[in-house]
Amino acid sequence: MSKGEELFTGVVPILVELDGDVNGHKFSVSGEGEGDATYGKLTLKFICTTGKLPVPWPTLVTTFSYGVQCFSRYPDHMKQHDFFKSAMPEGYVQERTIFFKDDGNYKTRAEVKFEGDTLVNRIELKGIDFKEDGNILGHKLEYNYNSHNVYIMADKQKNGIKVNFKIRHNIEDGSVQLADHYQQNTPIGDGPVLLPDNHYLSTQSALSKDPNEKRDHMVLLEFVTAAGITHGMDELYK
């Protein structure tokens, strides 16, 4: 067990703070919830503290919760590939470029680390080149979320990882908006981290609303499990 992994044996409180600017539309989001890495489970509620969110909530899911991939459930035989927990408590910087097909792009930078006993994800997001009447600024996405696989590989030069995946957002007219994600994670501290073999995270997300909440918000339930590396030969002969 890495030293960081020991911090994730029970329920951990999570705070998310995002400051965004998309085509000049500025906004802030606060999120709170908890994670349980034993089950790869995240429950979070997000509030737009600046009024109405200028972009659809589903376009921010990867920035919020795929940001705290330290809550992914890594099966016993894959624990030596869990970069995310090994970087804790000092944490990691997570940078992404998200290309929305035939539309604009988000660039995000986040610091994910423990502050006391709370896991904090502080994010800056800049969005440019979006069409004012496109699927994103035109709010044409359905309020739901598909399952995805998130592909992880080591980046030995930077003592971190590179991550690629493609999100499929459902559009109200029945078509799909693709969002290509290019992600890089580097540790904040200088302690040892686990550099993984190639594998993937399998994610399932459910979006809902709080019937008593008057502010613009999103409620998120997510399950994430690591997969893609089989048991070693020594396991087979036990």
Epitope: P13, L15, E32, K45, F46, T49
Partner: nanobody, 122 residues
Framework: QVQLVESGGGLVQHGGSLRLSCVTS????????MGWFRQAPGKERDIVAR????????YYADSVKGRFIISRDNTKNTVYLQMNSLKPEDTAVYYC????????????????RGQGTQVTVS
């Protein structure tokens, strides 16, 4: 689903007492600081009292110091507000809220909030 449900409000005479309760569900209560806020007609929503997750640190607005006591029972996922020596100016809707943040005092910044209970002092 996260829920915070306040109860115990009502009509009380000047100098009387009330005990408000806020029962929570859907989240891990004992990792959250809890706060009570109130909103009088035509006024802003102001913080009344706040209590740390373990219950050892409390904060009170000057207007209620020495009269109100905030407490919590982590085994019952409940926070209380004991209100004594009530005055007409305590008339308001009282809301409870939960947070992981150590520094915020504005009700609008709380992600988890209740629907409120009316307190009227005649």
């Amino acid at each position: 689903q996260v829920q915070l449900v306040e109860s115990g409000g009502g009509l009380v005479q000047h100098g009387g007492s009330l005990r408000l309760s806020c029962v929570t569900s859907g989240f891990t209560f004992d990792i959250h600081d809890m706060g009570w806020f109130r909103q009088a007609p035509g006024k802003e929503r102001d913080i009344v009292a706040r209590i740390s997750k373990s219950g050892d640190i409390t904060y009170y607005a000057d207007s209620v110091k020495g009269r109100f006591i905030i407490s919590r029972d982590n085994t019952k996922n409940t926070v209380y507000l004991q209100m004594n020596s009530l005055k007409p100016e305590d008339t308001a809707v009282y809301y409870c809220a939960a947070t992981l943040r150590a520094t915020i005092t504005s009700f609008d910044e709380y992600v988890y909030r209740g629907q409120g209970t009316q307190v009227t002092v005649s």
